[in-house]
């Protein structure tokens, strides 16, 4: 087969670069090395072109640089002679999104590269369980996200749509609360928040365990296991055990996988097993009293997941106590 060396060219060379809010990024541009190099990085919006960074006659020229880029851009000056015209861009803001054009001129070549910069943010979301009077709610919350995420709920692995969404931040980043009323339900719930730009997904899973009926002075074992489907082996996570009382949560124990440190806030609380395999975070609560009745919440959280397990404990008076009265 004869392959012709005849080409039709697309105008410019275009690349999409994705950065994160507040972080640094490199906008790439390369050229065949040459002498007397001229480099101009420009930002183009619908109305205007702004000078981002210029280099010619052997040095950076920032006299005409737009103020929004002051102290935030630089070139790799010692690599220019090797054909590197990439721009180092500090502290990205959402306003930096858009089209950047890098023009490079040498004695033998002219090159125009186009870079489309997109900026995203995805602060780790949270799943919260709240009781308001006699109602129970699950809240999926992301404090700072851009662009708008896709939020989906499932009940017993079946997608559902009835949720109440609240959003603040008109242009972004957005703060989003998605609330689901789960009063009287024994189902398991899952909330997924997806940032399609950053290709990041977070999942919150809530499970209500069967009620536990115990006698005073007995002990109770509260199960909480890390599901391998959710957590990868090297992922840092934290485990928090807390008790819900009149809508207020008080922490009983706290564990950090990175340091493998546990802090107990209740002396009667202890791990069921040694945390050798770091997957079973079941707890023992000893010497139960009537006031220990209530809801116990295990929260296992990483950057990508939150697993909430709820136990309802009913402590009843023992026979002796009952006959004494």
């Amino acid at each position: 087969i004869f392959l012709s060396a005849f080409f039709t060219y697309v105008p410019m060379n275009e690349q999409i670069i994705i950065g994160r809010l507040g972080e640094d990024i490199i906008l790439p541009s390369s050229f065949e090395r040459g002498s007397e190099v001229v480099i101009h990085w420009k930002y183009q919006d619908s109305y205007n072109s702004y000078n981002v960074h210029s280099y010619y006659k052997g040095s950076g020229r920032l006299e005409s640089q737009d103020t929004r880029y002051a102290n935030r851009t630089s070139l790799f000056y010692n690599e220019i002679q090797n054909g590197n015209a990439s721009l180092f861009f500090r502290r990205l803001s959402l306003l930096d999104e858009g089209i950047y054009t890098c023009y490079v001129g040498t004695a033998i070549q002219a090159i125009t590269n186009k870079v489309v910069l997109k900026v995203g943010v995805f602060l780790t979301p949270m799943m919260k369980y709240e009781k308001r009077n006699t109602n129970s709610f699950l809240i999926c919350n992301v404090l700072s996200v851009y662009p708008r995420p896709i939020i989906t709920w499932k009940m017993d692995n079946t997608p559902i749509s009835e949720n109440n969404m609240q959003e603040t931040g008109s242009l972004g980043p957005f703060s989003i609360n998605s609330t689901l009323n789960i009063t009287g339900s024994n189902s398991s719930y899952e909330c997924t928040i997806e940032n399609s730009l950053l290709k990041q997904t977070w999942t919150g899973r809530w499970t209500m365990k069967d009620g536990l009926h115990k006698m005073q002075s007995e002990h109770v074992s509260l199960s909480c296991e890390l599901v391998n489907d959710y957590f990868s082996p090297n992922q840092d996570f934290k485990v928090t055990w807390s008790r819900m009382e009149s809508g207020i949560s008080s922490i009983l124990a706290y564990y950090l996988s990175s340091s493998q440190n546990t802090t107990f806030y209740e002396s009667r609380f202890s791990w069921n097993k040694e945390l050798k395999n770091q997957s079973d975070f079941s707890m023992n609560l000893t010497d139960l009293s009537l006031s220990d009745s209530g809801e116990y919440l295990c929260n296992i959280s990483s950057d990508e997941y939150t697993l909430l397990t709820i136990h309802t404990v009913h402590v009843e008076p023992s026979q002796e106590t009952a006959s004494d009265n």
Partner: antibody, heavy 116, light 107 residues
Framework: QVQLQQSAAELARPGASVKMSCKAS????????MHWVKQRPGQGLEWIGY????????DYSQKFQGKSTLTTDKSSNTAYIQLTSLTSEDSAVYFC?????????WGQGTTLTVSS | DIVMTQSHKFMSTSVGDRVSITCKAS??????VAWYQQKPGQSPKLLLY???TRHTGVPDRFTGSGSGTDYTLTISSVQAEDLALYHC?????????FGGGTKLEIK
């Protein structure tokens, strides 16, 4: 020595398209950018755009975007300009010129006459 | 786009005279200016680039100067063969732009 040999004069009807060539010799074709410049009778020079044979892309002056298409054939060391939807405004001499930011060698020019 | 303005369309001079052709850019072009000579019926020829660097084979009677927005091509002692159209061009950034040209006539 460096030479840029351009195709013969063209006579075209309004609305038609034309393709002119520029054959390079005496240097490595892919090393240099090829520019195209327009000159109307008794007027100054207008930069149309460039094509980068080694990289495989081009850049155009806004005015000529859509009007002109630049291509190359590396096997024959030839650059081409195609002009579409011709009008009398396109009647001019078209030069190819080798260079980076300045144009050190020029073709002899191709005269395009658009007339009904 | 950067606009290059050559205020004199024509300049008249005598052989042996010193002549200066000017060119003004609409913004600072950082000495990235080239000058071309175009004789009747011919294609342009590069004389200078980076405002003052002579291209190979260009006689030293041609000199260039300037910075910022104002640039000058000077012919120290005009010869009869210098009768031509002179173009300035900014090679600072694309789209490259040319001045309207200055025609040098011999009296």
């Amino acid at each position: 020595q460096v030479q840029l040999q351009q195709s013969a004069a063209e006579l075209a009807r309004p609305g038609a398209s034309v393709k002119m060539s520029c054959k390079a010799s005496g240097y490595t074709f892919t090393t240099y950018t090829m520019h195209w410049v327009k000159q109307r009778p008794g007027q100054g020079l207008e930069w149309i755009g460039y094509i980068n044979p080694s990289r495989g892309y081009s850049d155009y002056s806004q005015k000529f975007q859509g009007k002109s298409t630049l291509t190359t054939d590396k096997s024959s060391n030839t650059a081409y300009i195609q002009l579409t939807s011709l009008t009398s405004e396109d009647s001019a001499v078209y030069f190819c010129a080798r260079g980076g930011y300045d144009f050190d060698y020029w073709g002899q020019g191709t005269t395009l006459t658009v007339s009904s | 786009d950067i606009v290059m303005t050559q205020s004199h369309k024509f300049m008249s001079t005598s052989v042996g005279d010193r002549v200066s052709i000017t060119c003004k850019a609409s913004q600072d072009v950082g000495t990235a200016v080239a000058w071309y000579q175009q004789k009747p019926g011919q294609s342009p020829k590069l004389l200078l680039y980076w405002a003052s660097t002579r291209h190979t084979g260009v006689p030293d009677r041609f000199t260039g100067s300037g910075s910022g927005t104002d640039y000058t091509l000077t012919i120290s002692s005009v010869q009869a063969e210098d009768l031509a159209l002179y173009h300035c061009q900014q090679h600072f950034i694309t789209p490259y732009t040319f001045g309207g040209g200055t025609k040098l006539e011999i009296k």
